[in-house]
């Protein structure tokens, strides 16, 4: 029969695991919100106004199903910030693009871990910034929907 000490330690482990899952869920929801905010601003901006925004190429992973695949998103945050910096104007304003991208990067690292040994396998096909954001939004939604509540 299990002792009281082993029962309490397994309960603590379960609670810790549940807490980690809740945190992971919160981080995913935060990342999803940030990506949706960016996409919303770009779409409200009437994509057509800035051809230079849509001429930029972004790279997507061959397949993204796990949190470690967020490395592929982290790898593209530099170019994403570059596009945001370039597209600042009267009708498309992000108060602090650097801070916005920095927050996304922090959330991504919390989710995938700080180990950068995983090398992203990018797809041969590239995407516009709009399609890039849509793809990562779908990724977050998929992980959230399959996570234990």
């Amino acid at each position: 029969a299990p002792t009281s000490s082993s029962t309490s330690s397994s309960t603590a482990e379960a609670q810790q695991q549940q807490q980690q899952q809740q945190q992971q869920q919160q981080h995913l929801e935060q990342l999803l919100m940030d990506l949706q905010e960016l996409l919303s601003r770009m779409e409200n901006y009437r994509n057509l106004k800035l051809p230079r925004m849509l001429t930029f190429k972004f790279y997507l992973p061959k397949q993204a199903t796990e949190l470690k695949d967020l490395q592929c998103l982290e790898d593209e945050l530099g170019p994403l910030r570059h596009v945001l910096d370039l597209t600042q104007s009267k009708s498309f304003q992000l108060e602090d693009a650097e801070n916005f991208i920095s927050n996304i990067r922090v959330t991504v690292v919390k989710l995938k871990g700080s180990d950068n040994t995983f090398e992203c396998q990018f797809d041969d096909e590239s995407a516009t910034v709009v399609d890039f954001l849509r793809r990562w939004i779908a990724f977050c939604q998929s992980i959230i929907s399959t996570s234990p509540q």
Epitope: K49, R52, L54, L86
Partner: antibody
Framework: EVQLVQSGAEVKKPGESLKISCKGS????????IGWVRQMPGRGLEWMGT????????RYSPSFQGQVTTSADKSISTAYLQWGSLRASDTAMYYC??????????WGQGTMVTVSS | SYELTQPPSVSVSPGQTARITCSGD??????AYWYQQKPGQAPVLVIY???ERPSGIPERFSGSSSGTTVTLTISGVQAEDEADYYC???????????FGGGTQLTVLG
């Protein structure tokens, strides 16, 4: 049908001014950039600049900055390219083209400008 | 100023495959577009965003991209494909558009 119709051929003398036009139809003219492209006789295409008719935001190639002016009148769905003082080297075919998210997808038929004394 | 480099001419026999390259430093981050221009006519878009084909353009036209080079491929070239082909893209800031110098495709025979 989506199309751009340009004004007719022009023959001018050096030093004269000129304004050529490009009228859009079959789409919302306001919300697509219009680009201008030069093609000198027997030569390739050169991007001159673009204008966004909704607010007349303009971008010029460094090679054409200060040499030409683009403008637009969204009320009549027309973009313009103008010169204050023409030179013989301005002799060329000038195309307007609509820039959408998928490049210069619709082109005008071109306006031939000849500058000769 | 930013430049795109194309070979001045390419010659192929009917039915063969023609490949026209275009190179530029910004191409890893900027999409490329290809236009066909026949004598006395306005250019026509044949490939957009590196690899996409507009409706109405024959399937024998395709595009690919690798690093600083993009390629227009015409498989099973036909006599009617004889024309000048131009690549177009933007500088690294996306501000200025630019055309390559153009490639004259000659269909032999």
């Amino acid at each position: 049908e989506v199309q751009l119709v340009q004004s007719g051929a022009e023959v001018k003398k050096p030093g004269e001014s000129l304004k050529i036009s490009c009228k859009g139809s079959g789409y919302n003219f306001d919300t697509y950039w219009i680009g201008w492209v030069r093609q000198m006789p027997g030569r390739g295409l050169e991007w001159m600049g673009t204008i966004y008719p909704a607010d007349s935001d303009t971008r010029y190639s460094p090679s054409f900055q200060g040499q030409v002016t683009t403008s637009a009148d969204k009320s009549i769905s027309t973009a313009y390219l103008q010169w204050g003082s023409l030179r013989a080297s301005d002799t060329a075919m000038y195309y307007c083209a609509r820039f959408s998210s998928s490049a210069y997808d619709i082109w005008g038929q071109g306006t031939m400008v000849t500058v000769s004394s | 100023s930013y430049e795109l480099t194309q070979p001045p001419s390419v010659s192929v026999s009917p039915g063969q495959t023609a490949r026209i390259t275009c190179s530029g430093d910004a191409l890893p981050r900027q999409f490329a577009y290809w236009y066909q221009q026949k004598p006395g006519q306005a250019p026509v878009l044949v490939i957009y965003k590196d690899t996409e084909r507009p409706s109405g353009i024959p399937e024998r036209f395709s595009g690919s991209s690798s690093g600083t080079t993009v390629t227009l491929t015409i498989s099973g070239v036909q006599a009617e494909d004889e024309a000048d082909y131009y690549c177009q893209s933007a500088d690294s800031s996306g501000t200025y558009h630019v055309f390559g110098g153009g490639t004259q495709l000659t269909v032999l025979g």
